[in-house]
């Protein structure tokens, strides 16, 4: 969490941002809140990006003002116009690109004063893994697949029964470049699996950590997966 304060002139206002990560090709949110104002027409929101001389987005007098927007953000940005009055200056960024990563500034002007706060935005690709029993294999084998990751992640297997065991000798991980030539499909195979055990396939890069669990018993197979972003710090 980053909390910024205005300086000089009018009173300062508190602006708060939260560091976040964007999944390339999908839509992302750059979070920013501020002390609200009574009149929408008195609120100016400017989003800026370090190293980019045009604006990322501007909202003033109750509407978007895009004459100074940089080309790299053309047609890809929007604020939540109906929530500006309650102090939400968050920016929706469509079709996140790898090059969108960087330091952003949320700059606010209201009748109460000015304020700004920075946020770090990371970009990459991350997806939920799915673990299945590979019935085609000669021995009991698990196959963990996740369709989109970038940068290249690490893959680690773990088991509930053999806690702390190193499965690197009995697993094989491959990375297959997807058609857009950036993200990769992750496939990891674990051999010599024993029944009545829960196995976890953990995929991690500097942006996200995802885990796919599978519990194999004689009577059923249970699966569970979750994904966690690693860099959500507020400012």
């Amino acid at each position: 969490l980053i909390i910024g304060f205005g300086i000089s002139g009018r009173h300062s206002i508190t602006v708060t941002t939260v560091a976040s990560a964007g999944n390339i090709g999908e839509d992302g949110i750059l979070s920013c809140t501020f002390e609200p104002d009574i009149k929408l027409s008195d609120i100016v929101i400017q989003w800026l990006k370090e190293g980019v001389l045009g604006l990322v987005h501007e909202f003033k007098e109750g509407k978007d003002e895009l004459s100074e927007q940089d080309e790299m953000f053309r047609g890809r940005t929007a604020v939540f116009a109906d929530q500006v009055i309650v102090g939400n200056a968050s920016l929706r960024l469509k079709n996140v690109q790898l090059t969108d990563a960087g330091t952003y500034k949320c700059y606010i002007i209201t009748s109460k004063g000015k304020g700004n706060a920075n946020l770090e935005y990371k970009t990459g690709a991350f997806s939920m893994p799915e673990v299945n029993v590979d019935y085609n294999a000669s021995s009991e084998t698990l196959r963990c697949e996740a369709p989109r990751w970038f940068p290249q992640p690490t893959v680690v297997w773990a088991s509930q029964v053999d806690q702390g065991a190193n499965f690197s000798e009995v697993s094989n991980t491959s990375f297959e470049l997807n058609s857009e030539n950036v993200t990769m499909k992750v496939v990891s195979v674990l051999y010599n699996v024993t029944i009545n055990n829960t196995y976890s396939c953990m995929i991690e890069n500097d942006i996200a950590k995802a885990t796919g669990d599978i519990k194999v018993t004689e009577s059923e197979i249970k699966r569970r997966s979750h994904l966690q972003l690693l860099n959500s710090k507020a400012s």
Epitope: L53, S67, E68, D70, R74
Partner: antibody, heavy 116, light 107 residues
Framework: EVQLQQSGPELVKPGASVKMSCKAS????????MNWVRQSHGKSLEWIGR????????NYNQKFKGKATLTVDKSLSTAYMQLSSLTSEDSAVYYC?????????WGQGTTLTVSS | DIQMTQTTSSLSASLGDRVTISCRAS??????LNWYQQKPDGTIKLLIY???RLHSGVPSRFSGSGSGSDYSLTISNLEQEDIATYFC?????????FGGGTKLEFK
């Protein structure tokens, strides 16, 4: 008052290179992109590319990649364009112009003549 | 690249006339259309940016309009000093592209 002062006319031989300059004054040099635009005799304007003076980043028109190289010297508030492997086709007036989306201030132009 | 077309390459008018110069883009340019004036000595000045916004110091007889891919520059009450060539330019996407220019002359 914003001013962009360009270097003087150049007469060079085919195959040579040339480096022209654009000195900015009246504003913070690193706050605005510097664009370069070509106008061949009696013709329209062609955007060559732009440089970000804050970090030296460049964007080029595909047509001029390998022909033009854009640089800056922040300490002198000056942008430069080097043109290489010159031919008579490169004879033109070259302008520097400030900003993104539109060019709000222009230099007076540098006339380049390529002739043997 | 986006193609910019100014169909009229030259235009004759009289002092006090109202003159309209048009410009068409090969695709929607979302109002990122700008107009420049080039005097016979080669000096170039911005007149209008973002379709209709008057650049500082430009006389109010200049105005711009349009949307999508069709735009125009209007000079009302033409003056002697308006003799020049006028170029449109799109700033929606890189590379910037310019129209071929419209040369304004007096009858």
């Amino acid at each position: 008052e914003v001013q962009l002062q360009q270097s003087g006319p150049e007469l060079v031989k085919p195959g040579a290179s040339v480096k022209m300059s654009c000195k900015a004054s009246g504003y913070t040099f690193t706050d605005y992109y510097m664009n370069w635009v070509r106008q061949s005799h009696g013709k329209s304007l062609e955007w060559i590319g732009r440089v970000n003076p804050s970090n030296g980043g460049t964007n080029y028109n595909q047509k001029f990649k390998g022909k033009a190289t854009l640089t800056v010297d922040k300490s002198l508030s000056t942008a430069y364009m080097q043109l290489s492997s010159l031919t008579s086709e490169d004879s033109a007036v070259y302008y520097c112009a400030r900003r993104h989306n539109y060019a709000d201030f222009w230099g007076q132009g540098t006339t380049l003549t390529v002739s043997s | 690249d986006i193609q910019m077309t100014q169909t009229t390459s030259s235009l004759s008018a009289s002092l006090g006339d109202r003159v309209t110069i048009s410009c068409r883009a090969s695709q929607d340019i979302s109002n990122y259309l700008n107009w420049y004036q080039q005097k016979p000595d080669g000096t170039i000045k911005l007149l209008i940016y973002y379709t209709s916004r008057l650049h500082s110091g430009v006389p109010s007889r200049f105005s711009g309009s349009g949307s999508g891919s069709d735009y125009s520059l209007t000079i009302s009450n033409l003056e002697q000093e308006d003799i020049a060539t006028y170029f449109c330019q799109q700033g929606n996407t890189l590379p910037w592209t310019f129209g071929g220019g419209t040369k304004l002359e007096f009858k």
